[in-house]
């Protein structure tokens, strides 16, 4: 009679974490009599996974009725697979005796465990940055196996190329992590922009995971200022407006100075939003020209989002008939309240 062979038909088996793994094993003969044992690994450090004869193996069940006399199928199912279960499993036939002795081993089945990556988390810089500056975004995802993974960066659907990615650890592990840093150049139109990190892995079946960051949390668009003089009905009054345009975020404080003296401070409230997500705001002053003997230098000074103040000035000629006129000069940052000047915003 032909000598017994132990057949493990599957060279490798891949299972998703949490599922059950079926490891197939059949023998070609009922002789010699003796039990089957399953081991993870070979050699002196091999671990017993299942013993047909004795022992308690709560995660292991036999696929067929291995207790039947004529049974030659010794396949097993291992439940609730984790990445730590990866390795080569050997089905080993023993010859009955005192003690039982190893007779023949199967060729082994390599079990690999697939684990999904966690949802990518994208984080941006701690401080806001202005257009034309380059900022860094990081993307992290953890807990995946096998190690092979693909990560891409996008800004508003356009793929980015300036990034560096590391998968850790460099050696073998039950699971892996990915960390990527992308560099993004900000533009004035980026308030509504998104940066997206996309992770593709064998466990995701072609449906990648995405993490996003809104550039609205990263960008600061400084305002542009324009001070203009408006003609008014009364001969002795001039309306001067300060147009604060294209700024983000909304946090903004405006101070009017007359000849370097603070006349009024107000905070942007009723702003208008532009299509690109930036804001516009206007503040005005009604100046009683008759109260002034000399020319008046009016300065609109804006402190945006805690940054150093920017300003624009307007020289008001009191001797001349009120006309629309304006000039840009630096303003002083000191002063006191001045009468005969009335203001508002909108």
């Amino acid at each position: 009679e032909e000598e017994l062979q132990v057949i493990q038909p599957d060279k490798s088996v891949s299972v998703a974490a949490g599922e059950s793994a079926i490891l197939h094993c059949t023998v070609t003969s009922l002789i010699p009599v003796g039990p089957i044992q399953w081991f993870r690994g070979a050699g002196p450090a091999r671990e017993l996974i299942y013993n047909q004869k004795e022992g308690h193996f709560p995660r292991v069940t036999t696929v067929s009725e291995s207790t039947k006399r004529e049974n030659m199928d010794f396949s097993i199912s291992i439940s609730n697979i984790t990445p730590a279960d990866a390795g080569t499993y050997y089905c080993v036939k023993f010859r009955k005796g005192s003690p039982d002795t190893e007779f023949k081993s199967g060729a082994g089945t390599e079990l690999s465990v697939r684990a999904k990556p966690s949802a990518p988390v994208v984080s941006g810089p701690a401080a806001r940055a202005t257009p034309q500056h380059t900022v860094s975004f990081t993307c992290e995802s953890h807990g995946f196996s096998p190690r092979d993974i693909t990560l891409k960066w996008f800004k508003n659907g356009n793929e980015l190329s300036d990034f560096q990615t590391n998968v850790d650890p460099v050696g073998e592990s039950v699971s892996y992590s990915i960390h990527s840093t992308a560099k993004v150049v900000l533009t004035r139109e980026d308030v509504h922009s998104q940066v997206i990190c996309e992770v593709a892995h064998v466990t995701l079946q072609g449906d990648p995971l995405r993490g996003t960051a809104n550039l609205s949390e990263t960008i600061r668009v400084p305002p542009t200022l324009e001070v203009t003089q408006q003609p008014v009905r009364a001969e002795n009054q001039v309306n001067v407006t300060c147009q604060v345009r294209k700024f983000y975020p909304q946090r903004l404080q405006l101070t009017w100075l007359e000849n370097g003296n603070v006349s009024r401070t107000e905070t942007a409230s009723t702003v208008t939003e532009n299509k690109d997500g930036t804001y516009n705001w206007m503040s005005w002053l009604l100046v009683n020209v008759s109260a002034h003997r000399d020319d008046v230098k009016l300065t609109c000074q804006v402190e945006h989002d805690g940054q150093p103040a920017v300003s624009k000035s307007h020289d008001l000629k009191v001797s001349a008939h009120p006309k629309e006129q304006g000039s840009n000069t630096a303003a002083e940052n000191t002063g006191s309240n001045e009468r005969n000047i009335y203001g508002g915003s909108g």
Epitope: G41, A42, P44, E47, E102, S105, G171, E172
Partner: antibody, heavy 122, light 112 residues
Framework: QVQLQESGPGLVRPSETLSLTCTVS????????WSWIRQPPGKGLEWMGF???????FYNPSLKSRVTISLDMSMNQFSLKMTSVTAADTAVYYC????????????????WGQGTTVTVSS | DIVMTQSPLSLPVTPGEPASISCKSS???????????LDWYLQRPGQSPQLLIY???NRASGVPDRFSGSGSGTDFTLKISRVEAEDVGVFYC?????????FGGGTKVEIK
């Protein structure tokens, strides 16, 4: 192609601890035994011990009380520590990979590092 | 521990001629699964050892077929059918059945 590279100090003082690291490149740590073998000048080979991918260790009883082998799969490295060294521990130290796929025995030490010479001297 | 004894200690050879090295173990290396866990290694001068034969008679990958291993139980033999100049060095047998793994004392093969 799997390669092994030993690293560590070439000179150790008597009574101190010898520490060597073997870096595995081009292959998997899994399913193999990772061994340390030494060869005193002009003498034969002596097996010191090995570690399996599951962390189980086996040591030569003649050295057991002094030797520790550890495995860092995340760095693809395994290490040897031997305490209380004497001049008799002067040798070329090899790290090696041992195959196992047929039962309780082993199926050949098929990959060796180039060896690192360790001298124990004051 | 299993004691491994090699003979001869030194073996002068003529290129093109056969050569034979003996290795004896203090206990049987034949396991119940039918495998004899004995390896043969060659250490060329200034180099690391190289695996030639495992399980008594299986040639390792890349080893020329002029090397062959035989034997079972406690008596094993390594044969070189036609010695070549590159075969000079020290040949070691090693038992791989149980720990501690033990080596023979080595056989130095040199050209006559």
């Amino acid at each position: 192609q799997v390669q092994l590279q030993e690293s560590g100090p070439g000179l150790v003082r008597p009574s101190e601890t010898l520490s060597l690291t073997c870096t595995v490149s081009g292959g998997s740590i899994r399913n193999y035994y990772w061994s340390w073998i030494r060869q005193p000048p002009g003498k034969g080979l002596e097996w010191m011990g090995f570690i399996y991918d599951n962390g189980r260790t086996f040591y030569n009883p003649s050295l057991k009380s002094r030797v520790t082998i550890s495995l860092d799969m995340s760095m693809n490295q395994f290490s040897l520590k031997m305490t209380s060294v004497t001049a008799a521990d002067t040798a070329v130290y090899y790290c090696a990979r041992v195959r196992a796929y047929s039962g309780i025995g082993l199926d050949g030490t098929d990959v060796w590092g180039q060896g690192t010479t360790v001298t124990v001297s004051s | 521990d299993i004691v491994m004894t090699q003979s001869p200690l030194s073996l002068p050879v003529t290129p093109g001629e056969p050569a034979s090295i003996s290795c004896k173990s203090s206990q049987s290396l034949l396991y119940s699964n039918g495998y004899a866990y004995l390896d043969w290694y060659l250490q060329r001068p200034g180099q690391s050892p190289q695996l030639l034969i495992y399980q008594g008679s299986n040639r390792a990958s890349g080893v020329p077929d002029r090397f062959s291993g035989s034997g079972s139980g406690t008596d094993f033999t390594l044969k070189i059918s036609r010695v070549e100049a590159e075969d000079v060095g020290v040949f070691y047998c090693m038992q791989a059945l149980q720990t501690p793994l033990t080596f023979g004392g080595g056989t130095k093969v040199e050209i006559k």
